[in-house]
């Protein structure tokens, strides 16, 4: 029971985590314009992995995709790659873990096979979570570096009295979503690995004991008991649950208000 709960919880936590990684990857707010100690602009800039957006104080938002592949910074490409690898591994892990769930019966699958699948999915979730955390952390590091570089020359003279304000970027919501999601996927993976230990059939080799009856000789071999009877699979009492994994197709974003003045 505890094993089933651990496995089920691990699956659910990982599912939430992977959904979060997907959401973070798609989000536009990886970096947002720093409003602190900055001249108050009627334009708010924010950037994602795939496009950059400008929200005007009039309420209009314009987003432009990065239509170049070679012109993008190597770090951004690396972050994209890490996030995609994380999503792919997580998705495969979810697929594997569905079949590995103790509460789902598929044919005459051995517990050892389920244990192996649980371990595989657990490792996949761990790697997926690490990829997401790494990707978000690389991006965050890039932001911090750029932030201090732009702070050093925040106001650059444009000949005479005219000044140009350099836009500084700080951590966007997607970074926090990514960190949390990566962490959840990692935790889910660890839980799956723990559940795997409980699922693995313990190979206890008892010596075959012979009982001699008066009429004829019958040998009971406890070692082969599980395989010979139907009790190992508990087919009578098993409730088969259809894994109804819900996916959220749409993340509704409400316009956040920035009171600039």
């Amino acid at each position: 029971m505890a094993v089933t709960a651990c496995q089920g919880l691990g699956f659910v936590v990982s599912l939430i985590g992977i959904a979060g990684i997907i959401a973070a990857t798609c989000m536009d707010q990886w970096s947002t314009q720093d409003l602190y100690n900055n001249p108050v602009t009627a334009v708010f800039n924010y950037q994602g992995l795939w496009r950059s957006c400008v929200r005007e104080s009039s309420g209009f938002t314009e987003c432009r995709g990065y239509f170049t592949l070679l012109g993008l910074p190597a770090m951004l490409q690396a972050v994209r790659a890490l996030m995609i690898v994380g999503i792919v591994l997580g998705a495969i892990g979810l697929l594997v873990s569905i079949f590995a769930l103790k509460c789902i019966r598929i044919g005459s699958m051995e517990d050892s096979a389920k244990a192996n699948m649980t371990l595989t999915s657990g490792i996949m979730f761990i790697v997926s979570g690490l990829c997401a955390i790494a990707g978000v952390s690389v991006f965050a590091n890039m932001l911090v570096t750029n932030f201090w570089m732009s702070t050093a020359n925040m106001y650059t003279g444009m000949g005479g009295m005219v000044q140009t304000v350099q836009t500084r970027y700080t951590f966007g919501a997607a970074l926090f979503v990514g960190w949390v999601a990566g962490g959840l996927t990692l935790i889910g993976g660890v839980m799956m690995c723990i559940a795997c230990r409980g699922l693995a059939p313990e190979e206890t080799n008892y010596k075959a004991v012979s009982y001699h009856a008066s009429g004829h000789s019958v040998a009971y071999k406890p070692g082969g008991f599980k395989a010979s009877t139907g009790f190992g699979s508990n087919t009578k009492n098993k409730k088969i649950y259809d894994g109804g994994a819900r996916t959220e197709d749409e993340v509704q974003s409400y316009p956040s208000k920035h009171d600039y003045v």
Partner: antibody, heavy 118, light 113 residues
Framework: EVQLQQSGPELEKPGASVKISCKAS????????MNWVKQSNGESLEWIGN????????TYTQKFKGKATFTVDTSSSTAYMQLKSLTSEDSAVYFC???????????WGQGTSVTVSS | DIVMTQSPSSLTVTAGEKVTLSCKSS????????????LTWYQQRPGQPPKLLIY???TRESGVPVRFTGSGSGADFTLTISSVQAEDLAVYFC?????????FGTGTKLELR
């Protein structure tokens, strides 16, 4: 056709209050913020602030905080600006203007003249 | 606050003449996010409200004659009227649409000789 119809001229005594209206038609009223602009004796224009009719959020310039108050009535697609504690400095023509892409004011009301005189 | 300086304050021209109005900002109005200059030009004819002519420094508002052209970047902007018509006699205002509070220039009055 987009139209912004403002209320008629006002003659007020110092210390009094005045409420100017701006009725919008020809577009989705809640889809655009409404700006208010002051023009003293035909000279330059001065931005007072704006209101988002959808959320009711208001933005005021420092100078007009406490002086001007924006409100909206979405059922009648009307924006209002109230000016308190009037002085001769408040004598001007006040415009409402729709806020659009590029932070522009693309449609303007005809203006409401406010005269403060004892 | 951002100071918008327009020059000249008034200009007397003849019909058909090419006119260039200048507008300088105390800070750059270029937004790095979309590489657009948040400068707007308005025309105000006598007894009328202002009318939007140009936004994003060079984008002509629909219905505005092609003789009106906006140019410039950063903090230096110009409005050019290629061939002045009688109906162009008005006051022209430039506006900072990038920094709060939104500020207007003092205006350039265009008069016919």
């Amino acid at each position: 056709e987009v139209q912004l119809q403002q209320s008629g001229p006002e003659l007020e005594k110092p210390g009094a209050s005045v409420k100017i209206s701006c009725k919008a038609s020809g577009y989705s009223f809640t889809g655009y913020k409404m700006n208010w602009v002051k023009q003293s004796n035909g000279e330059s224009l001065e931005w007072i602030g704006n209101i988002d009719p959808y959320y009711g959020d208001t933005t005021y310039t420092q100078k007009f905080k406490g002086k001007a108050t924006f409100t909206v009535d979405t059922s009648s697609s009307t924006a209002y600006m109230q000016l308190k504690s009037l002085t001769s400095e408040d004598s001007a023509v006040y415009f409402c203007a729709r806020y659009n892409r590029g932070n522009t004011m693309d449609y303007w009301g005809q203006g409401t003249s406010v005269t403060v005189s004892s | 606050d951002i100071v918008m300086t327009q020059s000249p304050s008034s200009l007397t021209v003849t019909a058909g003449e090419k006119v260039t109005l200048s507008c300088k900002s105390s800070q750059s109005l270029l937004n790095s996010g979309n590489q657009k200059n948040y400068l707007t030009w308005y025309q105000q004819r006598p007894g009328q409200p202002p009318k939007l002519l140009i936004y994003w420094a060079s984008t002509r508002e629909s219905g505005v004659p092609v003789r009106f052209t906006g140019s410039g970047s950063g903090a230096d902007f110009t409005l050019t009227i290629s061939s002045v018509q009688a109906e162009d006699l008005a006051v022209y205002f430039c506006q900072n649409a990038y920094f709060y509070p939104l500020t207007f220039g003092t205006g350039t009055k265009l008069e016919l000789r």
